[in-house]
């Protein structure tokens, strides 16, 4: 007996090939022997089997012996043993339908799960693996999950169902919802201004939704909401904003603050969460904002970072053109009776530097100049 | 796993230069800080300089400012220390290291001998 | 630049007794801002690139034996091997990497009596 594979929603073509090659009387019937079609002539006739409007021939075959089973909108329910009978001889295909769904929605949050079910019809026993758009392989039977979506499972998956070594290949669009970033860093200079961009990694046509930036501030026992704001058709409106500071948010995606001024007050760690409408969960987009300051008090030329740096950074003070006077792993150094000159103090990273401020130091008997 | 293999020994003459290279494999080449040790026969270490791969631009020891150049290729993996105006006394095996908070990978050191 | 200064120069130990080296920065290691002591340990056999034993002043790296710790702060710091085992006979060095240029003690000898 011939297996044949399908899949749900797809048409099947099963095939019935008689040795004269011209167009004789054929009938297809399903194994409760129910008549699907036949002809009678060049006509085509039908049934009463459940298959009656989804069923059809090749008539432009019949002339040459091929009396080929068409079924649309292939149903689960679908898989039977289907017999055409030609010549005095009987030909039977076994079909067999399968289905594979993703649980809910194909437009998941990172880090939700998702989970691949496959339908398949009584008595058949298939294995599935899929493969995901980053080369990942996973295995399973009548369910496939995978947890902790990333941005990089984004994509289609492609799976594979085998029964009686036959296979189907079934694609599915995956689209996981999320920042393009997990995390950024901004290095200011005191004063200067901050610019937070939060951009998504997927589009939409329609985008709804509601969202906040919570800030802890280094120097602050608690966090708290600095903005929220409404997402309407990726349309930005501010709903409220803190008075210090006063943060400014574009009209338009991608979502884009303004902070005034980069102050040690603010420097530290934000999160900015947006709940999307009819999805549970929300994306979450850390950002980070270390302030330098460098200042002269009497004979103290002191440089200074705030905000969440790592312990790996280096922090200099140095004259400019000249060595480094002072280089630590710290967020504070400082050099006591400064020479006159422009002085560098730097934030680095194995020799790249990160964050860059300069203090024009005068002759002792002057006020400091900062450029 | 960073596994750092470098260039084969060097004989020079006094005056001239020497380029050693390290290649790393196993790991994320642009992850790790990579230092450059020299040790001279029967001394202990002495460190030249170093260079992130991602942003490529080296920090070195005063001792061998001017003469020290520290360069990284992301595309090969590959690190190089090239260090001029040899004198009798660069000779020592050069050893490229890994990381930051103490050196977790080493190569396995090249001998360079400065001999006229 | 920070001097690293170890003692003593050379060590005699038999088998399975305690052997300890210190090691002394000419200034603090210890940073304020990140409460991190940065000085690491490390052994070198003849022949052989060093390996990593300690950082942080007490890590231990992976793969180090147990018997190897790492204690002090500031500028004072210790490295004991708590029970000597022939395949310890080697060179130890510190170093510190919290300023540049990072510097390296001169070494300590450990042999067994």
């Known amino acids: 007996k011939k297996v044949v594979l399908g899949k749900k929603g797809d048409t099947v073509e099963l095939t019935c090939t008689a040795s004269q090659k011209k167009s004789i009387q054929f009938h297809w019937k399903n194994s409760n022997q129910i008549k699907i079609l036949g002809n009678q002539g060049s006509f085509l006739t039908k049934g009463p089997s459940k298959l009656n409007d989804r069923a059809d021939s090749r008539r432009s075959l019949w002339d040459q012996g091929n009396f080929p089973l068409i079924i649309k909108n292939l149903k689960i329910e679908d898989s039977d043993t289907y017999i055409c009978e030609v010549e005095d001889q009987k030909e039977e295909v076994q079909l067999l339908v399968f289905g594979l769904t993703a649980n809910s929605d194909t437009h998941l949050l990172q880090g939700q799960s998702l989970t691949l079910t496959l339908e398949s019809p009584p008595g058949s026993s298939p294995s599935v693996q899929c493969r995901s758009p980053r080369g990942k392989n996973i295995q399973g039977g009548k369910t496939l999950s995978v947890s902790q979506l990333e941005l990089q499972d984004s994509g289609t998956w492609t799976c594979t169902v085998l029964q009686n070594q036959k296979k189907v290949e079934f694609k599915i669009d995956i689209v996981v919802l999320a920042f393009q970033k997990a995390s950024s860093i901004v290095y200011k200079k005191e004063g200067e201004q901050v610019e937070f961009s939060f951009p998504l990694a997927f589009t939409v046509e329609k985008l709804t939704g509601s969202g906040e930036l919570w800030w802890q501030a280094e120097r602050a026992s608690s966090s708290k909401s600095w903005i929220t704001f409404d997402l309407k058709n990726k349309e930005v409106s501010v709903k409220r904003v803190t008075q210090d500071p006063k943060l400014q948010m574009g009209k338009k995606l991608p979502l884009h603050l303004t902070l005034p001024q980069a102050l040690p007050q603010y420097a530290g760690s934000g999160n900015l969460t947006l709940a999307l409408e009819a999805k549970t969960g929300k994306l979450h987009q850390e950002v980070n904002l270390v302030v330098m300051r460098a200042t002269q008090l009497q004979k103290n030329l002191t440089c200074e970072v705030w905000g969440p740096t790592s312990p790996k950074l280096m922090l200099s003070l140095k004259l400019e053109n000249k060595e480094a006077k002072v280089s630590k792993r710290e967020k504070a150094v400082w050099v006591l009776n400064p020479e006159a000159g422009m002085w560098q103090c730097l934030l680095s990273d194995s020799g790249q530097v990160l964050l860059e401020s300069n203090i024009k130091v005068l002759p002792t008997w002057s006020t400091p100049v900062q450029p | 796993q960073v596994q750092l293999v470098q260039s084969g020994a060097e004989v020079k003459k006094p005056g001239s230069s020497v380029k050693v290279s390290c290649k790393a494999s196993?790991?994320?080449?642009?992850?790790?800080?990579i230092n450059w040790v020299r040790q001279a026969p029967g001394q202990g270490l002495e460190w030249m300089g170093w260079i992130n791969p991602i942003y490529g631009s080296a920090n070195y020891a005063q001792n061998f400012q001017g003469r020290v150049t520290i360069t990284a290729d992301e595309s090969t993996s590959t690190a190089y220390m090239e260090l001029s105006s040899l004198r009798s006394e660069d000779t020592a095996v050069y050893y490229c290291?890994?990381?930051?908070?103490?050196?977790?990978?080493w190569g396995q050191g090249t001998l360079v001998t400065v001999s006229s | 630049d920070i001097v690293m200064t170890q003692s003593p120069d050379s060590l005699a130990v038999s088998l399975g007794e305690r052997a300890t080296i210190n090691c002394k920065s000419s200034q603090s290691v210890l940073s304020s801002s990140y409460n991190k002591n940065y000085l690491a340990w490390y052994q070198q056999k003849p022949g052989q690139p060093p390996k990593l034993l300690i950082y942080?002043?007490?890590t231990r790296a992976s793969g180090v034996p147990d018997r190897f710790s790492g204690s002090g702060s500031g500028t004072d710091f210790t490295l004991t091997i708590s029970s000597l085992q022939a395949e310890d006979v080697a060179v130890y060095y510190c170093q510190q990497y919290y300023d540049t240029p990072l510097t390296f003690g001169q070494g300590t000898k450990v042999e067994i009596k």
């Open positions: 942080w002043a007490s």
């Open positions: 196993g790991g994320t080449f642009s992850n790790n800080d």
């Open positions: 290291a890994a990381d930051w908070r103490g050196f977790d990978y």
